[in-house]
Amino acid sequence: QRFAQAQQQLPLESLGWDVAELQLNHTGPQQDPRLYWQGGPALGRSFLHGPELDKGQLRIHRDGIYMVHIQVTLAICSSTTASRHHPTTLAVGICSPASRSISLLRLSFHQGCTIASQRLTPLARGDTLCTNLTGTLLPSRNTDETFFGVQWVRP
Amino acid sequence: QRFAQAQQQLPLESLGWDVAELQLNHTGPQQDPRLYWQGGPALGRSFLHGPELDKGQLRIHRDGIYMVHIQVTLAICSSTTASRHHPTTLAVGICSPASRSISLLRLSFHQGCTIASQRLTPLARGDTLCTNLTGTLLPSRNTDETFFGVQWVRP
Amino acid sequence: QRFAQAQQQLPLESLGWDVAELQLNHTGPQQDPRLYWQGGPALGRSFLHGPELDKGQLRIHRDGIYMVHIQVTLAICSSTTASRHHPTTLAVGICSPASRSISLLRLSFHQGCTIASQRLTPLARGDTLCTNLTGTLLPSRNTDETFFGVQWVRP
C-alpha cells in the first residue's frame, strides 16, 4: 500500500514522460535561418514538460529515444507562390553541442505550402534542436499551421 | 507478490493507454464539411480503446496529452485534378463543448492529393474532435489512404 | 524495496517498448518494388530494439498496436522532375505471412518530392512489413530524408 502511494506521488517527469509542443514565436534575423519557438499554457495549447527553451531553441533534459515531429506552413501561400520562389527547405537537427551536430529531418516545399513529418531519434540530455528554414518565404505563425514537438518514447 | 498480480489484472484503460484509429465512413450532407468516421475490428484494422464515436465524431474519455494524427487522400485524384479545383483544406479541431472549440491542425492540398500530419495537444474528457474538409472534392475511403487517430501520451 | 529493484532490472523489451528506426540501404532489382532497410548504431542514428531485419524488411517480435511512420524523398528531385514521370507511389504493408498481407499506408508523389505519414495499426509477432516504391524514380539514401520506423504503443 505504501509502495503504491509512493509511486503515485512520483513526479511524472521521473517516469520519463518528457514531452513538448511548441508554437512559432518569430524567425531569426536575415542571416539566421533558425525558427524561434515558444511554449506554455499562457500562449494557448503549447507546453513543455521536461524539455526547456534556450533562446527559442528546444533543449532536451533526459536521455532517450524521442519522437520528433514538425509542421511548417508558409504564410499567405498558394502553389503558385511556392513555385515562384527558390526552393524552401526545412531541416531539424541537433545544433549543440557542436560535437553532436547533425541533421535529423529534412523536407523541401515543392509547389506546396506545408511540410509535415516525424521521426524517432536518440537524443541526449543537453542536446539542443534547431529548425532551419532556408529560403525567403515567411512561415505562418498560426498555431494550427506551424508547430514543433518532441515526445520521449523509451530510454 | 499480491501487488504485482493486482497490477497485471488492471484493465489497460486504467493505465491511460487510450488509443483509436478510424477509417472514413462518409462525408456529411452538402452544407456539413465534417468527415464521419467509423472504427472497429469488424471493419478491418480500425479500433477504439477508450475514446468513443458520437455520430461519427471522436469523443475523448480521458484527460491528457494526445498525439493526434491524420491522413486524407482525395478520391481519383492527380495533381491535374487538384489544380483544377478551388483549394481544399482539412482542419482537425475540438468542436464540442463549444467553450473549448479550437482548430488544432490545418493543412491545404496545394496541387497535391494527400495531406498527412500529426501533433501533440492537451485534450480533456468529453472533448469531441471534428475533421472538416472544406472544398468540393470527395475524399478516398480506402483504409490505407484516409485515416484518423489519437494516442494518449501522458497525463 | 526488493520489488522496486526487480522492476528496474527487467529488460526494457519485457515492458513492451519495442521500437525501430531504419535508414534506406538499397532498392531492389528491377522487378522488385521493395525498399531494403538497415539499422544499427554503427550506421548512424538508426536502431532496432525488439523488431528485427529479415533481408532488409522489418519483422515484428511483439503483438500490439504500433505507430508506423515513414518518410521517403526522391533523389535529385524537383517538382519538375516529379511531374515528368509516371506517378510514383509508396505503400507500406504487411507482406508476410501471406495470410495477413494487407496495405497499411499508401501515398503518391504528386509534383512533390517527399511523402511523409504515420498511422496506428495492430501488428502481430512475425508480421513482416514491406515498403513498396512503384515508379522509376530513385529514392534518396540521405538519412534525414528517407527513414522508416515503428513504435510499440500498447498491447
Epitope: - | L74, A75, I76, C77, T136, L137, L138, S140, R141, N142 | -
Partner: antibody
Framework: QVQLQQSGPGLVQPSQSLSITCTVS????????VHWFRQSPGQGLEWLGV???????DFNAAFISRLNINKDSSKSQIFFKMISLQPNDTAIYYC??????????????WGQGTSVTVSS | DIVLTQSPTSLAVSLGQRATISCRAS??????????MHWYQQKPGQPPKLLIY???NLESGVPARFSGSGSETDFTLNIHPVEEGDAATYYC?????????FGAGTKLELK
C-alpha cells in the same frame, strides 16, 4: 431553384461555328463545374468538355481542336463554341451541372437542350 | 476510353414487376473506395435525369423503387415495382476518368 437555360441557333451551315450560351440560376459558377454533352441517334450521348469552377477547361480529345468553353461567373453564363461543323455534328447539345463533389462527375441538373442541325 | 455495354437494348415489363438493366465496363470503374458509375433516366424530348450516383446512392427526390448495385466492371439498375411513368430510356455513365462515357441505353416499355 437550380436551372440551366440554353440559347443558341437551330441551324448551322457546314464549316461554320456553333455558339451556345448556358445561363444558370440557383447556384454559383465559382462553386460548380458545368459539362457539355451532345446526343445524336448515331453516336448516343457523348461528353464534349467541362469548365471547372476555377475556369480551367478539359475537353474530349476527339473535339479538342474544335472546341472552346469559357464563362462569365458574375453573369452566371457559360459560353460554348464549336468550329468547323459538319453534318455529322447534327445533335442535341446539352449543358449539365456537375454534382456538388467536383471529382464525382455526375450531372444532377441539365439544360433543356439545343437542337442543332448542320445543313446547307 | 472506357466502353460501357448496356443490356438488354430494350425490355418490356408489366406494371408492378421488376425491371433489371445491366451495364458492363471495359475496365474497372471502382477506385478510392467508391464505384464511379451513375444511372440516368431520359424521356422523349427531355434531358437525362440523374437517378443513382456512385452505383447505389439514390439521388434526392428519386423514388426508392429505383436501386443500383455492382462494383468493378459489372453494375445493375433495378426498378421494382415498375410504374407507368417509368417508361423511358435508361443510361449508365462512368466517371472514373475523363472522358466520361455513356452506355448506348436501354429502352424500357410497359406491357
Amino acid at each position: 431553384q437550380v436551372q440551366l437555360q440554353q440559347s443558341g441557333p437551330g441551324l448551322v451551315q457546314p464549316s461554320q461555328s456553333l455558339s451556345i450560351t448556358c445561363t444558370v440560376s440557383g447556384f454559383s459558377l465559382t462553386t460548380y463545374a458545368v459539362h457539355w454533352f451532345r446526343q445524336s441517334p448515331g453516336q448516343g450521348l457523348e461528353w464534349l468538355g467541362v469548365i471547372w469552377s476555377t475556369g480551367i477547361t478539359d475537353f474530349n480529345a476527339a473535339f479538342i481542336s474544335r472546341l472552346n468553353i469559357n464563362k462569365d461567373s458574375s453573369k452566371s453564363q457559360i459560353f460554348f463554341k464549336m468550329i468547323s461543323l459538319q453534318p455529322n455534328d447534327t445533335a442535341i447539345y446539352y449543358c449539365g451541372r456537375n454534382s456538388y463533389y467536383g471529382n464525382l462527375y455526375a450531372m444532377d441538373y441539365w439544360g433543356q437542350g439545343t437542337s442543332v442541325t448542320v445543313s446547307s | 476510353d472506357i466502353v460501357l455495354t448496356q443490356s438488354p437494348t430494350s425490355l418490356a415489363v408489366s406494371l408492378g414487376q421488376r425491371a433489371t438493366i445491366s451495364c458492363r465496363a471495359s475496365k474497372s470503374v471502382s477506385a478510392s473506395g467508391y464505384n464511379f458509375m451513375h444511372w440516368y433516366q431520359q424521356k422523349p424530348g427531355q434531358p437525362p435525369k440523374l437517378l443513382i450516383y456512385l452505383a447505389s446512392n439514390l439521388e434526392s427526390g428519386v423514388p426508392a423503387r429505383f436501386s443500383g448495385s455492382g462494383s468493378e466492371t459489372d453494375f445493375t439498375l433495378n426498378i421494382h415495382p415498375v410504374e407507368e411513368g417509368d417508361a423511358a430510356t435508361y443510361y449508365c455513365q462512368h466517371s472514373r476518368e475523363l472522358p466520361l462515357t455513356f452506355g448506348a441505353g436501354t429502352k424500357l416499355e410497359l406491357k
